[in-house]
Each structure stands twice: as structure tokens, then as C-alpha cells.
């Protein structure tokens, strides 16, 4: 019985699922395919975070191609997401900062934040996994920059956001990288590891774009995306590469990834996700 | 073995409140490892889920939008029951209503249903 | 609200041949863990209906080995590997994605 074929998922802090993009496949690059027509389409350019034309030549490619541009934008940006929230100068906060936290009807031990409207402060809690609603965050970076007020009773300042598709939690853009890089490699770096539809278990490596690291999944042997590699290194070679720090005056360096600590420490327990 | 018997009305006259009631046995109301539906099955709508009731540190409840004005579902801890109120019914409301486990701990589904109750709203 | 859209609507089968059930979502399914936020429940005739498939693709207790779930993102189907009188009823597929929770309209497997 395949009941018993579930793996026990462990995610530590140094391990973090990736942030998603609504659909994962609005991360991959604009690929007109081998055939010689001229299509208009369009695509969702990560780097632009927009929807962009492109020339399809009218078969093979991949998903993140749409008809229109009003496709595109429906698949791969909210609009009630992907507007900037707030900025220093509004006072209001998004409406789910005020419901209350709802852990779902699923049971998986996930870490999550939430704003309290009592205490005026996010709080952690324990996400089931599925379900719950929009006032749930992945850190109490991300909780306290859209729902808490700054010192002067101002929001904090904002940047954009999207909608996170797994749980409808809004999740600041600049938070799939620390704000400190700019990602300029292979878009599938910033894609989720995907198992695939099969039911082999190769070791294999994945680039996750939250920690900025190269880590190991079981490959199912068939499917999943591109973020999929044999070695750590190949993984390494392809991804870590992308990352380029911006310096004050605007210029751009390339880096070994050194990370500035984070302004908020976020203290995340080892999550014991149930038989997902 | 879970079961889930349902006890309620077939008939009810348009603009009154249907009540239904399920009855658990081989589980708890107030268990944090599941969770407690409603859902209707028609001809015209197939089956719709209509609100969910679940206990974690306090009780919770989500409904569905389409009957979000009108509905209350109540779990009754004394008697290991959760019912359905459902007001100011018309005959769209006519249905077999279905009450339902979601197993919340592995399975992550509906994985006990109650025998179904034909409801009929009629004058 | 999540559409889930099933195809066909009307199945007929051969007892010992496979059968095929296509659901298709309004919008992805899968979570960042590899959840895929998708059930199957068969309904028989006369009968409530009963969980087969949970997450995608893991078979619910006293489930026979002929069912598979299998899919990703939109698109997901259920196998039969080799029908059996038995199976007849309403095949329904539903999302838990995000609310309200929403069912596909049913496909039902009769036997020729």
C-alpha cells in the first residue's frame, strides 16, 4: 500500500522549503522552441517581474507561454498582490493583517508568523500545511514588514510583493533573495525542487534560492523541472554564479556569497512536516 | 472505525431553517487530528462543499461564500455531534447533504462521509 | 473560486482493460514541500462517496494497487490498471488548495 511509501520530511533552518512563484513554470525562460513561425506570445520575466513579448516559433517551448498578455498576468502576478503594498508614508494595513491566525484544517508542524492584532505584534505559530488564510508568513521578517508599524507608527517600508500560491500568504519579492543580491543566472535556479511523477529515489541537489545553498532531494527519476543536478558542484556551477551584490553607489560586483546578517533573526525549529 | 450518523428533517418549507445533525462515533468532535464538514450533492451542482469546523488551540471554522450568510455549523461536545443550521432556505437548496471527516493528520481528505440525507425544500 | 474541470464525463470500460480520468484545475495545485493539494473519491452507486487517492497520488486504506493517481501543477489523472465490475460509480476529483474546497463535476465509469 503506497500509504507506507510517504517519506518522513525533516526541514531545519538550514534547509527551508523555496519560495514559490504562483506557478512555478512563470520562472522559466522565454523559449520560442525549434520550429520557424512567427507567434506573438507572451512571458513572465522574473528579472522584469512583468509580463514581456516574446516570439513563439510554434511548438515544443515550455509553460510559460500565454496567448495574452492579460493570461500571462492572470497566471503569473496578482494584481492584488503584486502592487507595493504600502510605503512608509500609509498608514493602513493590508486587511488579513487583522484575521486572526488559523493553522488549516491539515496537520504538518510548519513554522509560520502571523501579525496579532492584540499584542500588535507578529507572533509565531504552527501552520498545518494546507489551507488557513492570507495572515501567514514564511518570516517574521516578511510578517513584521507588511503588517507591524515602524517606530513612528508608520508601516515599515515596502517593497512588492506575490502572492505565495501554496497558502495565499503574501510574500515580499525581495525575500526569494536577500535584499543585498540580485539573481541574474538560470531562472530555474530560483524554481522549487521537484520530485517528479516516478517512484525512484536518486539522490540529486537542488539550488534553494532562499538560503543560498545547494541541497540534496530524492529525485523520483522522471519529470520535476530543471533545478535538478548529479553533483553539488554542477549545482554550485550553475546557480551560485547568478548572484551579484549590489554596492551603495549603484555599480555591481560580482561576489562569493557572503551573506549580511539578516536584520531580524529568525529563529526557526527544526519543523517536523507529518507524513507529507 | 469512524462513523458519522446523520439525523435531520427530509422536508422543510421554503424560507425556514433546515437542521441537520451528525453523530460521531470512533472519534472525537474536539480531536486536533481532524476536521468536520458539510457538503450537498445535487443534480444541478454536484457535490459542494458547504463549511468546515475544526479544534486545534480553539475552535475554527471556514464556510463558503455561497451560503456564507446563512450558515452555522456547531460542534456539540457533550453528545460528540456537530450540526448544520442552514437559514432562510429555498427549493435551490434541495439536496442530499452529506456530513464528512477530513482526516487531517495523513491522509489529508474526506475519509468518512455520513449515509447522506435527502432534503427537500418545499411548500 | 477553483474550477475543476473532468474529462470525459461519461466513461464506458471493458472489465480487464485500463481506464483513464482526467482532472484539470483552474490554477496549480502543488505546494512547495511536493504536496499536491488533490483527492479522488469514487461514489458508488446509492453509496456516499469514499476516498481512493489523497495527496496526488497515495492511496487511501483498503484501496486495491489498481488505482494510481498521477499528476502536477493543473493537469491529474486517475488510473485503473485493469477495471473491474466493482468500479463502477462517479469518479469525483477535488482541490484543497485554497477555499472554498471544490469538486470536480464527476465522471461516471460504467461497464460496457
Known amino acids: 500500500d503506497s500509504e507506507e511509501d510517504e517519506e518522513h520530511t525533516i526541514i531545519t533552518d538550514t534547509e527551508l522549503p523555496p519560495l514559490k512563484l504562483m506557478h512555478s513554470f512563470c520562472a522559466f525562460k522565454a523559449d520560442d522552441g525549434p520550429c520557424k513561425a512567427i507567434m506573438k506570445r507572451f512571458f513572465f520575466n522574473i528579472f522584469t517581474r512583468q509580463c514581456e513579448e516574446f516570439i513563439y516559433g510554434g511548438c515544443e517551448g515550455n509553460q510559460n507561454r500565454f496567448e495574452s498578455l492579460e493570461e500571462c498576468k492572470k497566471m503569473c502576478t496578482r494584481d492584488n498582490a503584486n502592487r507595493i503594498i504600502k510605503t512608509t508614508l500609509q498608514q493602513e494595513k493590508p486587511d488579513f493583517c487583522f484575521l486572526e491566525e488559523d493553522p488549516g484544517i491539515c496537520r504538518g508542524y510548519i513554522t509560520r508568523y502571523f501579525y496579532n492584532n492584540q499584542t500588535k505584534q507578529c507572533e509565531r505559530f504552527k501552520y498545518g500545511g494546507c489551507l488557513g488564510n492570507m495572515n501567514n508568513f514564511e518570516t517574521l521578517e516578511e510578517c513584521k514588514n507588511i503588517c507591524e508599524d515602524g517606530p513612528n507608527g508608520f508601516q515599515v517600508d515596502n517593497y512588492g510583493t506575490q502572492l505565495n500560491a501554496v497558502n495565499n500568504s503574501l510574500t515580499p519579492q525581495s525575500t526569494k533573495v536577500p535584499s543585498l543580491f540580485e539573481f541574474h543566472g538560470p531562472s530555474w535556479c530560483l524554481t522549487p525542487a521537484d520530485r517528479g511523477l516516478c517512484r525512484a529515489n536518486e539522490n540529486r541537489f537542488y539550488y534553494n534560492s532562499v538560503i543560498g545553498k545547494c541541497r540534496p532531494f530524492k529525485y523520483s527519476g522522471c519529470g520535476g523541472n530543471e533545478n535538478n543536478f548529479t553533483s553539488k558542484q554542477e549545482c554550485l556551477r550553475a546557480c551560485k554564479k547568478g548572484f551579484i551584490q549590489r554596492i551603495s553607489k549603484g555599480g555591481l560586483i560580482k561576489t562569493k556569497r557572503k551573506r549580511k546578517k539578516q536584520r531580524v533573526k529568525i529563529a526557526y525549529e527544526e519543523i517536523f512536516v507529518k507524513n507529507m | 472505525q469512524v462513523q458519522l450518523q446523520q439525523s435531520g428533517p427530509g422536508l422543510v418549507k421554503p424560507s425556514q431553517t433546515l437542521s441537520l445533525t451528525c453523530a460521531i462515533s470512533?472519534?472525537?468532535?474536539?480531536?486536533?487530528?481532524?476536521?468536520w464538514s458539510w457538503i450537498r450533492q445535487s443534480p444541478g451542482r454536484g457535490l459542494e462543499w458547504l463549511g468546515i469546523?475544526?479544534?486545534?488551540?480553539?475552535?475554527?471554522?471556514q464556510y463558503a461564500v455561497s451560503v456564507k450568510s446563512r450558515i452555522t455549523i456547531n460542534p456539540d461536545t457533550s453528545k460528540n455531534q456537530f450540526s448544520l443550521q442552514l437559514n432562510s432556505v429555498t427549493p435551490e437548496d434541495t439536496a442530499v447533504y452529506y456530513c464528512a471527516r477530513w482526516h487531517s493528520d495523513k491522509m489529508w481528505g474526506f475519509d468518512d462521509w455520513g449515509q447522506g440525507t435527502l432534503v427537500t425544500v418545499s411548500s | 473560486d477553483i474550477v475543476m474541470t473532468q474529462s470525459p464525463l461519461s466513461l464506458p470500460v471493458t472489465p480487464g482493460e485500463p481506464a483513464s480520468i482526467s482532472c484539470r484545475s483552474s490554477q496549480s495545485l502543488v505546494f512547495s514541500f511536493g504536496i499536491t493539494y488533490l483527492n479522488w473519491y469514487l461514489q458508488k452507486p446509492g453509496q456516499s462517496p469514499q476516498l481512493l487517492i489523497y495527496?496526488?497520488?497515495n492511496r487511501a486504506s483498503g484501496v486495491p494497487d489498481r488505482f494510481s493517481g498521477s499528476g502536477s501543477g493543473t493537469d491529474f489523472t486517475l488510473k485503473i490498471s485493469r477495471v473491474e465490475a466493482e468500479d463502477v460509480g462517479v469518479y469525483y476529483c477535488?482541490?484543497?488548495?485554497?477555499?472554498?474546497?471544490?469538486f470536480g463535476q464527476g465522471t461516471k465509469v460504467e461497464i460496457k
Open positions: 495527496k496526488g497520488s
Open positions: 477535488q482541490q484543497y488548495d485554497s477555499y472554498p474546497l471544490t
Open positions: 469546523i475544526y479544534k486545534r488551540s480553539k475552535w475554527y471554522n
Open positions: 470512533g472519534d472525537s468532535v474536539s480531536s486536533n487530528s481532524a476536521a
